[in-house]
Interface confidence: medium
């Protein structure tokens, strides 16, 4: 007959690593006589034999957790007692290992530029997963604005347009990697005016284009206000490219006004607006434009017949009692003055005076005269007729003109529209547009209108040595 023997645990419990939903087994091998009674505890709490999550076999020497949960973490002990000697105990830990799991994934976010955005990414896993973020196809780098928080969330300070895009978070530990779904960060930008409309000082009956460019996300809409009310006339052309809206308001100017460009976009239930204003004033460069009373008709006079384009419509000013006779008389008087000028100056001056007094005319509801382009006026005044112009201005200052000469129809160049700005808004003087082969001689009054581009009349390229460098105001 065997002698009684106190229990001895021959295989002490060891630490067991187990994955969630997998099986974990603790073995507690005991030698004793008589056979011991073996009980199991978890964190010092007795495991009940009828708990269906556990299986206890081999006379209690094997404890199996049938489907490990992350809450099964803890210290498991087996206690063996057979009444001989004291009870014996061995303990081991269960470490529940867990592949990364994203418990709170990021969601789509719309945020206004300049604010702070937080994309959540809460994770579980053992070992604790490290969290990183991907934007588009590339790993996202942290910087002074962009940080991954301890919680795994992505925080972006002072959100910029370039932060917009698709993001996903990545949770990684030694057991695996988990990816969130792609989410979209949309950055909304308050409407902002990039290019404000410019103020214009124009002649009556001019066409003016006011341009306003705005940016924003969503793309703003642009509306125009004239003197506080919606614009009643004019045409608006709009184009959108790369989130920039370009609006051009073309106006036919018959009165001065304050024009405001308003750019608006919507952010949720709120709107953002930006405004810029420009004035359009009417330059008083001649009385006839001030009242702009007149009509368009073919030129039937003689003095400017060779200068003006054949069959062209010209503007006649009805502030004169008999406009056609009055204007012809004015040009006739001016013509006599021109007899004394140099052969270089005369054709240019004739072209200037004829085109200024008999301006090209656009018929319509309001007949519109088209003034000479500023650059052509300057070329006549400063290049072709520099000496004469200086002398004439000197006489004017000293009051030496004979009766009626104060009406000499000489434009003030600086008040005329620039061809550089809008080549369609003014009249060119064809006699200043030379043929290449005519550079060395002054063209006849009936020369054609090709273009060449010499800046002045240097002695090296022309047969007459003319210095254009005279001071003119």
């Amino acid at each position: 007959e065997k002698l009684p023997k106190a229990p001895v645990i021959t295989t002490p419990l060891e630490t067991v690593d187990a994955l969630v939903e997998e099986v974990a087994t603790f073995m507690c091998a005991v030698e004793s006589y008589p056979q011991p009674e073996i009980s199991w505890t978890r964190n010092k709490i007795l495991i009940k034999l009828f708990d269906t999550r556990y299986s206890i076999r081999e006379n209690g020497q094997l404890l199996t957790i049938l489907s490990v949960e992350d809450s099964d973490d803890g210290i498991y002990c087996c206690i063996a007692n057979n009444g001989v000697g004291g009870a014996v105990e061995s303990c081991g830990a269960l470490q529940v290992k867990m592949k990364p799991k994203i418990t709170r994934p990021p969601i789509n976010v719309k945020i206004i530029e300049g604010l702070k955005a937080v994309l959540p990414c809460t994770t579980m896993g053992n070992p604790k997963p490290s969290v990183s973020w991907i934007k588009g196809d590339n790993a996202l780098r942290e910087n002074s604005r962009i940080a991954v928080l301890e919680s795994g969330s992505l925080r972006i300070h002072n959100v910029q347009k370039e932060d917009a895009g698709q993001y996903r978070c990545v949770a990684k530990n030694s057991l695996g990697t988990a990816y969130s779904k792609l989410v979209k960060l949309e950055v909304e930008v308050f409407a902002r005016i990039l290019r404000a409309p410019e103020s214009h000082n124009v002649t009556f009956g001019s066409f003016v284009t006011l341009r306003c460019t705005a940016i924003g996300i969503p793309v703003p809409t642009i509306s125009w206000i004239e003197n506080g009310n919606a614009v009643s006339s004019g045409s608006i052309q709009e184009s959108v490219k790369d989130r920039v809206i370009d609006s051009r308001l073309q106006l036919f100017i018959t009165k001065p006004g304050l024009y405001t460009c308003i750019a608006t976009n919507k952010h949720g239930e709120k709107f953002s607006t930006a405004k810029a204003a420009a004035t359009v004033s009417i330059a008083e460069w001649s009385k006839s434009q001030k009242d702009s009373q007149g009509y368009c008709a073919q030129y039937r006079g003689e003095v400017c017949d060779a200068v003006l384009a054949k069959d062209a419509l010209v503007f006649f000013n009805t502030s004169y009692r008999d406009p056609e006779d009055a204007q012809e008389l004015l040009i006739h008087t001016a013509w006599n003055e021109l007899k004394a000028v140099s052969p270089l100056c005369r054709p240019a001056a004739e072209a200037l005076l004829c085109n200024h007094l008999f301006q090209e005319c656009s018929p319509g509801v309001v007949p519109t005269p088209m003034p000479i382009c500023r650059e052509y006026c300057l070329a006549v005044k400063e290049l072709f007729c520099a000496k004469e112009w200086q002398a004439m201005e000197g006489k004017a200052h000293r009051g030496l003109y004979r009766s009626g000469m104060h009406l000499l129809p000489v434009p003030e160049c600086s008040k005329l529209p620039s061809m550089h700005r809008d080549p369609t808004a003014c009249t060119r003087l064809p006699y200043l547009d030379y043929k290449k082969e005519n550079i060395t001689t002054f063209p006849s009054i009936t020369s054609s209108r090709p273009s060449a581009d010499i800046p002045n009349l240097p002695a090296s390229t022309s047969s007459f040595a003319v210095s254009p460098a005279y001071s003119m105001t």
């Epitope: 300057l378 290049l383 290449k436 273009s451 254009p468």
Partner: antibody, heavy 124, light 107 residues
Framework: EVQLVESGGGLVQPGGSLRLSCAAS????????IHWVRQAPGKGLEWVAS????????YYADSVKGRFTISADTSKNTAYLQMNSLRAEDTAVYYC?????????????????WGQGTLVTVSS | DIQMTQSPSSLSASVGDRVTITCRAS??????VAWYQQKPGKAPKLLIY???SLYSGVPSRFSGSRSGTDFTLTISSLQPEDFATYYC?????????FGQGTKVEIK
């Protein structure tokens, strides 16, 4: 969109030669003037040469006259600056610029479009 | 050659200040004078042409004027983006000349 793109710059020894090109697009090359303007390191702008495409007339600064030649190929919309007998004082960023407008009018326009510049270094 | 003498060669100013830069031609010239703005490492940009015409897209705080052989560029209310070097240029004669430049710095 108007564009001017210079090329051909680089390092050259004193007495050597270089040819700069200015490729133009977005405007009517044949009725514009093309200018070369240079800027020595830390210095101001210095006009070098001009060509008036439709007439072929050319003008040069005294400092480069006889050494530099400006030309244009209107079929290729390209202007050139042939630089010979280069000196250390020719070291600069060379810009090409254009001004529009016909004949006399062009001088009133200013140089409204410029290239990004190309660096010419003359050093032994 | 026509010389363009620009003054001052540099100036310090604050945002909101009115700034005036002058160019004096060595002899009588036409209105074929332009003003440019240049920032470091960039090409110049046209501001004013024909002595007083504002180039398209240039803010209206910039203006140009002429009195005899003196040409003036005025910035009515200096903005942060206006700190740069400014040049005048004449093309009144076939030999173009630039002023020596005025650097506008932050005070």
């Amino acid at each position: 969109e108007v564009q001017l793109v210079e090329s051909g710059g680089g390092l050259v020894q004193p007495g050597g030669s270089l040819r700069l090109s200015c490729a133009a697009s977005g405007f009517t090359f044949s009725s514009s003037s093309i200018h070369w303007v240079r800027q020595a390191p830390g210095k101001g702008l210095e006009w070098v040469a001009s060509i008036y495409s439709s007439s072929g007339s050319t003008y040069y600064a005294d400092s480069v006259k006889g050494r530099f030649t400006i030309s244009a190929d209107t079929s290729k919309n390209t202007a050139y600056l042939q630089m010979n007998s280069l000196r250390a004082e020719d070291t600069a960023v060379y810009y090409c610029a254009r001004s529009g407008g016909e004949f006399y009018i062009t001088s009133y326009y200013g140089m409204d479009y410029w290239g990004q510049g190309t660096l010419v270094t003359v050093s032994s | 050659d026509i010389q363009m003498t620009q003054s001052p060669s540099s100036l310090s100013a604050s945002v909101g200040d009115r700034v005036t830069i002058t160019c004096r031609a060595s002899q009588s010239v036409s209105s074929a004078v332009a003003w440019y703005q240049q920032k470091p490492g960039k090409a110049p940009k046209l501001l004013i042409y024909s002595a007083s015409s504002l180039y398209s897209g240039v803010p209206s705080r910039f203006s140009g004027s002429r009195s005899g052989t003196d040409f003036t560029l005025t910035i009515s209310s200096l903005q942060p983006e206006d700190f740069a070097t400014y040049y005048c240029q004449q093309s009144s004669s076939s030999l173009i000349t630039f002023g020596q430049g005025t650097k506008v710095e932050i005070k």
